[in-house]
């Protein structure tokens, strides 16, 4: 056959040769020839390549900068990048998690629907009728109004989304 124009999986075409790609964790040192195999070398400390490749340089592991609120969630290997996450009380600003911001708090009248994680912010929801929140918090849900009836009391002041009801004693029937 003539020299190939297409190559098998995990190979690449160069100078009419099908050369083996370097395996994950290794970089290309020299292309194969008619008489020699592709030469690859392992990535150095703090470097990685995560695919079969013909890269001449490995990628640097991501740096989890504590000044940006980041910390290492999973240490990188020669085949995987470092995964960063945010310090407690903070979350990533993007999927790549390159910096962190403080979890938002839900204002009075709103409660926490979903508590924030290292990668997602707090989700707030308005307190529906019958519930209230009187604090700014990243953890507190909307609380139900107090049930005056179960305490043998009556509502003296109606509740709002920011305040609880005020209960008081029932008026005594006069003789």
């Amino acid at each position: 056959p003539e020299p190939p124009t297409a190559c098998r999986e995990k190979q690449y075409l160069i100078n009419s040769q099908c050369c083996s790609l370097c395996q994950p964790g290794q970089k290309l040192v020299s292309d194969c020839t008619e008489f020699t195999e592709t030469e690859c070398l392992p990535c150095g400390e703090s470097e990685f390549l995560d695919t079969w490749n013909r890269e001449t340089h490995c990628h640097q592991h991501k740096y989890c900068d504590p000044n940006l609120g980041l910390r290492v969630q999973q240490k990188g290997t020669s085949e995987t990048d470092t995964i960063c996450t945010c310090e407690e009380g903070w979350h990533c600003t993007s999927e790549a998690c390159e910096s962190c911001v403080l979890h938002r708090s839900c204002s009075p009248g709103f409660g926490v629907k979903q508590i924030a994680t290292g990668v997602s912010d707090t989700i707030c929801e308005p307190c529906p009728v019958g519930f209230f929140s009187n604090v700014s918090s990243a953890f507190e849900k909307c609380h139900p109004w107090t049930s005056c009836e179960t305490k043998d009391l009556v509502v003296q002041q109606a509740g709002t989304n920011k305040t609880d009801v005020v209960c008081g004693p029932q008026d005594r029937l006069r003789a």
Epitope: P1, S20, S30, D31, E34, T36, E37
Partner: antibody
Framework: DIQLQQSGPGLVKPSQSLSLTCSVT?????????WNWIRQFPGNKLEWMGY???????EYTPSLKNRVSITRDTSMNQFFLRLTSVTPEDTATYYC?????WGQGTSVTVSS | DAVMTQNPLSLPVSLGDEASISCRSS???????????LNWFFQKPGQSPQLLIY???NRFSGVPDRFSGSGSGTDFTLKISRVEAEDLGVYFC?????????FGGGTTLEIK
């Protein structure tokens, strides 16, 4: 076009050293490939003597390891063969080769 | 070392005939990536060897398609489909999978 041009003496005395030069044009010997020395004895038998790689490391055939060395001059794009303590059994035609391209050959006779 | 055994030593043919040359290795020439570095060369008297086939079956540039290589592991074959006058000379196999590289003893293609 890639060319390999050989130079060196055709007659060497026994016990002396044989030195040959291979000058490469059209391709840098530091880019890739193994740069070989091969000899052919009377009667056509071919023997691979060794190579110097593009990165400067070398390999030799075990039977000649103590007597052979292959070096290079990257600034001149040349590589060299040195064979010490020659005997009449080293009489052969010596080739430098990238294997897809060959030098013209140098006929070397070892005789006093 | 991988010992390369070529057969026949001499192959008398008529022009236009098919010629077949065998090359056997004492060990497998397939490497860990599944590649096999077995080459065929042709040499005319007074000339340097020239590459015909590399990696078992790949024709080198400019080599006519009447030349074909096949085989795997330890057994390899060079076929010339219709012998022409310019094909007469010596054919060698060479393995470069293992160091030291080793040649077959050669097969002389001659007129019957």
């Amino acid at each position: 076009d890639i060319q390999l041009q050989q130079s060196g003496p055709g007659l060497v005395k026994p016990s002396q050293s044989l030195s040959l030069t291979c000058s490469v044009t059209g391709y840098s010997i530091t880019t890739n490939y193994n740069w070989n020395w091969i000899r052919q004895f009377p009667g056509n038998k071919l023997e691979w003597m060794g190579y110097i790689r593009y990165d400067g490391t070398s390999e030799y055939t075990p039977s000649l390891k103590n007597r052979v060395s292959i070096t290079r001059d990257t600034s001149m794009n040349q590589f060299f063969l040195r064979l010490t303590s020659v005997t009449p059994e080293d009489t052969a035609t010596y080739y430098c080769a990238r294997l897809d391209y060959w030098g013209q050959g140098t006929s070397v006779t070892v005789s006093s | 070392d991988a010992v390369m055994t070529q057969n026949p030593l001499s192959l008398p043919v008529s022009l236009g005939d098919e010629a077949s040359i065998s090359c056997r290795s004492s060990q497998s020439l397939e490497n860990s990536n599944g590649n096999t570095f077995l080459n065929w060369f042709f040499q005319k008297p007074g000339q340097s060897p020239q590459l015909l086939i590399y990696r078992v079956s790949n024709r080198f540039s400019g080599v006519p398609d009447r030349f074909s290589g096949s085989g795997s592991g330890t057994d390899f074959t060079l076929k010339i489909s219709r012998v022409e006058a310019e094909d007469l000379g010596v054919y060698f196999c060479l393995q470069v999978t293992h160091v030291p590289y080793t040649f077959g003893g050669g097969t002389t293609l001659e007129i019957k």
